[in-house]
């Protein structure tokens, strides 16, 4: 019954979660954990905020939105297949067992672009080795590594493919939103 989100290997994954603070700056603690939301707290915590700031985070996990306005969506950098699974966003509303809990399913697909290592040529002088794709937050990148012998038109097509696949996974219009207060 979890809402499903998708990303490709090497991309940044975006898991949306929002709440509306009762008043500006009146923040609620939030935790993100790997695995379905347990009864209390978060299991396998990857990121946590308190009433003021992000007070715990682990490598590759960050909040790209304005968490002071209730955007506590999680970005996972440079995902691998091992990042697949359920993630818990827990809005820790004051009270007894009063938390809002959202289970989000992340599905990681193999990258579309996995060129076979044929004749090696260094295109660094002519083209950047990193093609920027559109996404949430800082420029997200797909490392191409050593490319086969391809022409400029193919490079352009490749860039468009990468951009389009990222746009297809743009999840701005979905995600959990709750109002507090």
């Amino acid at each position: 019954s979890e809402v499903e989100y998708r990303a490709e290997v090497g991309q940044n994954a975006y898991l949306p979660c929002f709440y509306t603070p009762a008043a500006p700056g009146n923040l609620v603690p939030v935790c993100w954990g790997k695995g379905a939301c347990p009864v209390f707290e978060c299991g396998n915590v990857v990121l946590r905020t308190d009433e003021r700031d992000v007070n715990y985070w682990t490598s590759r996990y960050w909040l790209n939105g304005d968490f002071r306005k209730g955007d506590v969506s999680l970005t996972i950098e440079n995902v691998t297949l091992a990042d697949s699974g359920i993630y818990c966003c827990r809005i820790q509303i004051p009270g007894i067992m009063n938390d809002e809990k959202f289970n989000l399913k992340l599905v990681i697909k193999p990258a579309k672009v996995t060129p076979a290592p044929t004749r090696q040529r260094d295109f660094t002088a002519a083209f950047p080795r990193m093609l920027t794709t559109r996404g949430h937050g800082p420029a997200e990148t797909q490392t191409l590594g050593s490319l086969p012998d391809i022409n400029l038109t193919q490079i352009s097509t490749l860039a468009n493919e990468l951009r389009d696949s990222r746009l297809a996974n743009d999840l701005r219009d979905s995600g959990a939103t709750i109002r507090i207060g």
């Epitope: 979890e2 009270g95 938390d99 809990k101």
Partner: antibody, heavy 113, light 107 residues
Amino acid sequence: QVQLQESGPGLVKPSETLSLTCKASGYTFTSSDINWVRQPPGKGLEWIGWIFPGDGSTKYNPSLKSRATLSTDKSKNQASLNLSSVTAADTAVYFCARGLDYWGKGTTVTVSS
Amino acid sequence: DIQMTQSPSSLSASVGDRVTITCKASQDINSYLGWFQQKPGKAPKTLIYRADRLVDGVPSRFSGSGSGQDYTFTISSLQPEDIATYYCLQYDEFPLTFGPGTKVDIK
């Protein structure tokens, strides 16, 4: 605003199954815990069980000896309690609550033949 | 299961008096303790959570304290509208368990 409303038959015969529903509104039903609590006449509060509508996880009070079953209907924003093989000792006011901060008004159930 | 004992079971006090109720858990409950007020024919109302945190909108004359197994609930100046039964609850682990309640009335 958060509202919960319990409903069900006011009278149940001994050995039958008691079925109650809890209609929730004013919040995202699938994201919050639901607890069921009962109160026999003139007595204290007794926790019956917990369910998380998001994934259907449940916990029960062992004192009820597996007679209680909690479920939810997400399409109706509704939680349900079934209590089997009832006796006069199950006569009580039954409450549902979001977490344990927002409570319904309660519904009175009498077990009698 | 965690047992909760509450004392006294009932008390009478005058308006303006300081009222104290205690609750003891059979094991450490890590401050996962709440206090509820229940008036006749009504649902319980949460006053205190996490042992000492006041729910928004609850008058400041109500307070809670304690840790480990021992907890206290205080009404600093009893008001007529405080006539009710008060329950403690541990929510450190399942099954959740309530204290037997303390009935408070006016002398």
